[in-house]
């Protein structure tokens, strides 16, 4: 009973709930993640326990430093929710729930080009589609490695489209597109498609 009274006597601001966080919130299957359970009280020896739903993942002791739990996200159920417990003697507090978002990475998109050639201009339509990867997917079009479109968000498995009109160029242009979803630092690019110069009658993408 004494330990319980001690716990009840502890003011909330003296022993508040711990904080559970991860630098990575959006992950793909197979990714290793670190979860940090920390407490504002830096002077107490605290026992931290990590739970996912109703299973216990591990326990660590710490003082002043957060407990670090390293996990591998390999299955959908491992997205969470997670919570951690900070315990001092019989006094314990729980963190808020934390869940990861599991996202399938985008595969390399395919770029298709359609051109309508007039005497003075080329009307170019670029289509870009990544057939795999969690939606939404953001597509950006490039000409000679320079972005020529804003990010176009697609919430369905339909190609992104971008139209441009160019004076008949004297030199060839190289186009490619980028596909990116919520996975940080993970973007894929299409193979480049080269538009030849207007010299002669060569316009392989033109509608006659």
């Amino acid at each position: 009973r004494k330990a319980v009274l001690d716990c009840e006597a502890m003011k909330t601001n003296e022993f508040p709930s711990p904080c559970l966080d991860s630098k990575t919130k959006v992950v793909m299957k197979g990714q290793n993640v670190s979860m940090f359970c920390s407490h504002k009280n830096k002077s107490l020896q605290i026992t931290y326990s990590l739970f996912r739903r109703k299973t216990h993942l591990g326990t660590q002791d710490g003082k002043g430093e957060p407990a670090i739990f390293n996990l591998s996200i390999t299955e959908a159920h491992e997205s969470g929710p997670y919570k951690c417990k900070a315990q001092v003697t019989s006094c314990s507090k729980y963190s808020r729930d934390f869940s990861f978002t599991i996202v399938d990475p985008v595969t390399s998109p395919v770029l298709n080009i359609m051109v309508i050639q007039t005497e003075t201009d080329r009307h170019i339509t670029l289509h870009c589609l990544s057939v795999n990867g969690s939606l939404p997917i953001n597509y950006t079009f490039f000409e000679n490695h320079v972005a020529i479109s804003p990010a176009i968000s697609k919430y369905d498995r339909e190609p992104a489209e971008f139209n441009l009109t160019k004076k008949n160029p004297g030199e060839e242009e190289e186009y490619r597109c980028e596909a990116k979803n919520r996975l940080p630092n993970y973007a894929t690019y299409s193979h480049p498609v080269t538009m030849p110069s207007t010299g002669g009658d060569s316009c392989p993408f033109c509608l006659k």
């Epitope: 326990s49 299973t55 216990h56 591990g58």
Partner: antibody, heavy 119, light 111 residues
Framework: EVQLVESGGGLVQPGGSLRLSCAAS????????ITWVRQAPGKGLEWIGT???????YYSTWAKGRFTISRDNSKNTVYLQMNSLRAEDTAVYYC?????????????WGQGTLVTVSS | IQMTQSPSSLSARVGDRVTITCQSS????????LSWYQQKPGKAPKLLIY???RLASGVPSRFSGSGSGTQFTLTISSLQPEDFATYYC????????????FGTGTKVTVL
């Protein structure tokens, strides 16, 4: 078919040891938790211990030290090693599987294996 | 941890409403880490209720669970012939380690 089959039970003398096996089929032990439960003749259910998908083990206070749970992922089998057996350890021993991420919601059970401790 | 079920036994008729309680000496984890099982002689237990009140797959809707923290109830709204059996609660705890405890059991027999 999802199934658990216990084996290894039998007659053992007081002070002796026995290793029970729980062979799992239709699912992987790297995802699910396995719990050992026993039931003495005419008595209630008693939690012995648990091994979760990460290989962490947890034991009832009375089982700690004498009983050890382990697993062999390649054989998809969980073991219960019982040492220093006493007459009061006579019981039917069950292994059971929990829900994903819920160690003690035991929805799949084996048929049980009888352990008799007697001289 | 003490998990006390009451009554330890009861007699009832088909069609009766039956209530079994499970009292824990400590709060279960998350206040709802509690399940209920039915066991018939010579058979392994069968999961009926989890998360204190959620019906397990394939379990008839006449079974229901309620409660939170330390006090839980299993109710059979209209007892059927196949419901005569022994019932156990099982709680999960994290107060001093991660562990589980079964209730003492309640035997339901024909009046």
């Amino acid at each position: 078919e999802v199934q658990l089959v216990e084996s290894g039970g039998g007659l053992v003398q007081p002070g002796g040891s026995l290793r029970l096996s729980c062979a799992a089929s239709g699912f992987s032990l790297t995802i699910y938790t396995i719990t050992w439960v026993r039931q003495a003749p005419g008595k209630g259910l008693e939690w012995i211990g648990t091994i979760n998908s990460y290989g962490n083990t947890y034991y009832s206070t009375w089982a700690k030290g004498r009983f050890t749970i382990s697993r062999d992922n390649s054989k998809n089998t969980v073991y219960l090693q019982m040492n220093s057996l006493r007459a009061e350890d006579t019981a039917v021993y069950y292994c059971a599987r929990g829900y994903v991420d819920s160690d003690w919601y035991l929805n799949i059970w084996g048929q049980g294996t009888l352990v008799t401790v007697s001289s | 941890i003490q998990m006390t079920q009451s009554p330890s036994s009861l007699s009832a008729r088909v069609g009766d409403r039956v209530t079994i309680t499970c009292q824990s000496s400590e709060s279960v984890y998350d206040n709802n880490y509690l399940s209920w099982y039915q066991q018939k002689p010579g058979k392994a237990p069968k999961l009926l209720i989890y998360d204190a009140s959620r019906l397990a797959s394939g379990v008839p809707s006449r079974f229901s669970g309620s409660g939170s923290g330390t006090q839980f109830t299993l109710t059979i709204s209209s007892l059927q012939p196949e419901d005569f059996a022994t019932y156990y609660c099982l709680g999960g705890y994290d107060s001093s380690g991660w562990y589980a405890a079964f209730g003492t059991g309640t035997k339901v027999t024909v009046l």
